[in-house]
């Protein structure tokens, strides 16, 4: 393959074993169009917090308010949907927390916590004190609207007490909920007053009502389930990576590109180069050199390591990632200092991703 290639066909075929470059299923926050949404960045000890949406830096505007660890979106629209991240920059490191925002007419917010704490919900009464059913832990029932990504597990809980001990049954959309109503059925854990549905699908959407009753009375509580369907997306690159770097002549440096993609991504590290003293070809396109790409002979493609650098290595390094949906790229600059100057890590991060325009 030529070491100099024009922009037009830099897409190489990935040969590496199939991998998922992705985060575990992020939490989903749901708002209806026109509503306001407030999210708190769930990271500790954050000196500075920066926010991104779909890998692009998010700044304050007339609808987006950033105050400390809080992000507020006023008058949400479907265009606000996407993968958000907050990055906490500390003196020694940085950490990123991801979450999804889904602005839709369907309501939602997922809950699949483990049943590690249900035993205390099973209240035993003094046999003389006859009592109609009552809720023992209303905090666990406050969130009525649940939106869960397809294929996730859903759990609804109705912790109750009473004497004699009440029974619990479940309705879906006001009718008896039978095992045959869904593929794979469902589990009821009476000890924990819970209904569990695994691997939810769109047909699971609806209202789920727990009816808790004994001979002295009956109470009920309704949850609304929305199943949020995923759709494939082009690669998302973590904001701020690769980061600008500087080193002395003869030093070593690493650029890191963090990729999130459901579909197999193809990663390329590209540098602008000169050919015959020119940076651009006769067609006006820049000369590009592919330094590294994902493939069978390439170790961790998300990292570009440069050893024993020279002044000629200074310049812009581009991390370009493509999948069958689309592509994304971000770049960083390497500054090579004369030997006597000490290197430092630079702060402000990405150059424009539109480097090919």
């Amino acid at each position: 393959r030529p070491s100099f290639s024009l922009v037009e066909d830099t897409t190489l075929e990935p040969e590496e074993p199939p991998t998922k470059y992705q985060i575990s299923q992020p939490e989903v926050y749901v708002a209806a169009p026109g509503e306001s949404l407030e999210v708190r960045c769930l990271l500790k000890d954050a000196a500075v917090i920066s926010w991104t949406k779909d890998g692009v830096h998010l700044g304050p505007n007339n609808r987006t308010v950033l105050i400390g660890e809080y992000l507020q979106i006023k008058g949400a629209t479907p265009r606000d949907s996407g993968l958000y991240a907050c990055t906490a920059s500390r003196t020694v490191d940085s950490e990123t927390w991801y979450f999804m925002v889904n602005v839709t007419d369907a309501i939602s917010s997922g809950d699949d916590e483990d049943d590690t704490d249900g035993a205390e919900d099973f209240v035993s009464e003094n046999s003389n004190n006859k009592r109609a059913p009552y809720w023992t832990n209303t905090e666990k029932m406050e969130k009525r609207l649940h939106a869960v990504p397809a294929a996730n597990t859903v759990k609804f809980r109705c912790p109750a007490g009473g004497n004699p001990m009440p029974t619990m049954r479940w309705l879906k959309n006001g009718k008896e909920f039978k095992q045959e109503h869904r593929i794979g059925g469902y589990k009821v854990r009476n000890q924990h007053w819970s209904l569990i549905m695994e691997s939810v699908v769109p047909s699971d959407k609806g209202n789920y009502t727990c009816v808790v009753e004994n001979e002295y009375g009956s109470i009920n509580h309704t949850y609304h389930l929305d199943v949020v369907e995923r759709s494939p997306h082009r690669p998302i690159l973590q904001a701020g990576l690769p980061a600008n770097a500087s080193t002395v002549v003869g030093g070593d440096v690493e650029f890191v590109c963090k990729v999130y993609s459901d579909a197999q991504p193809h990663i390329q590290w590209i540098k602008h180069v000169e050919k015959n003293g020119s940076k651009y070809g006769p067609d006006g396109l820049p000369y590009l050199k592919v330094l590294k790409h994902s493939g069978i002979n390439s170790s961790n493609a998300e990292v570009l390591a440069l050893f024993n650098v020279t002044e000629a290595d200074a310049g812009e390094y581009i991390c370009k990632v493509s999948n069958y949906i689309g592509q994304a790229n971000q770049s960083a600059w390497l500054t090579v200092l004369p030997k006597q100057q000490a290197p430092g890590r630079e702060k402000e991060i990405t150059a424009s991703p539109d480097y090919l325009e």
Partner: antibody
Framework: QVQLQQSGAELVKPGASVKMSCKAS????????IHWVRQTPGQGLEWIGL????????SYNQKFKAKATLTADKSSSTAYMQLSSLTSEDSAVYYC???????WGQGTTLTVSS | NIVMTQSQKFMSTSVGDRVSVTCKAS??????VAWYQQKPGQSPKALIY???YRYSGVPDRFTGSGSGTDFTLTISGVQAEDLADYYC?????????FGGGTKLEIK
């Protein structure tokens, strides 16, 4: 809603060239690949190549590299495929599809005949 | 190039039945497989991506499964409107290749 509108059927002579279009609407044209796929009764569905409209990056199936040229016009949200040195073997239905192959055009029927 | 093989060219089923269309990749493609439905005279329609994720609006009787080299599209409770050709495709590596198709016929 997302739509891909392809140009009409073409009847051309062997040796000629043809340029078909695929006009996208209902989404941000520049951030999704446009794929081109051909369908023949004998060969089924074959991927020809893709273009990323934002920067013009292309990737071709080696089989079609000398046959097809993919371009895109961001201002009109239109992708184009030019096919050259046509023979009767190129007679087929040609589809464009958006990035994840989630939306397809209605197809352009190409007939190469003398 | 990765070869996608749909060994059954034709499958016959009855309304209400459960049917499984299979597809085999010539090498490990992880879960980078999609399924398409094509009715006579129409463009292909995307059903499943990443082996098991249904596109929005696709009836939940269509289920995709598998990883590595073996993949299955299952239709539980076949409807008359499911009469069509079904194609698998790998989106792991260019050139993105399709299976030869399976024609589903309703008895």
């Amino acid at each position: 809603q997302v739509q891909l509108q392809q140009s009409g059927a073409e009847l051309v002579k062997p040796g000629a060239s043809v340029k078909m279009s695929c006009k996208a609407s209902g989404y941000t044209f520049t951030i999704y690949n446009i794929h081109w796929v051909r369908q023949t009764p004998g060969q089924g569905l074959e991927w020809i190549g893709l273009i990323y409209p934002d920067n013009g990056d292309t990737s071709y199936n080696q089989k079609f590299k000398a046959k097809a040229t993919l371009t895109a016009d961001k201002s009109s949200s239109t992708a184009y495929m030019q096919l050259s040195s046509l023979t009767s073997e190129d007679s087929a239905v040609y589809y464009c599809a958006r990035g994840g192959f989630d939306y397809w055009g209605q197809g352009t029927t190409l007939t190469v005949s003398s | 190039n990765i070869v996608m093989t749909q060994s059954q060219k034709f499958m016959s089923t009855s309304v209400g039945d459960r049917v499984s269309v299979t597809c085999k990749a010539s090498q490990n493609v992880g879960t980078n497989v999609a399924w398409y439905q094509q009715k006579p005279g129409q463009s292909p329609k995307a059903l499943i991506y990443s082996a098991s994720y249904r596109y929005s609006g696709v009836p939940d009787r269509f289920t995709g499964s598998g990883s590595g080299t073996d993949f299955t599209l299952t239709i539980s409770g076949v409807q008359a409107e499911d009469l069509a050709d079904y194609y698998c495709q790998q989106h792991y590596n260019t050139p993105y290749t399709f299976g030869g198709g399976t024609k589903l016929e309703i008895k």
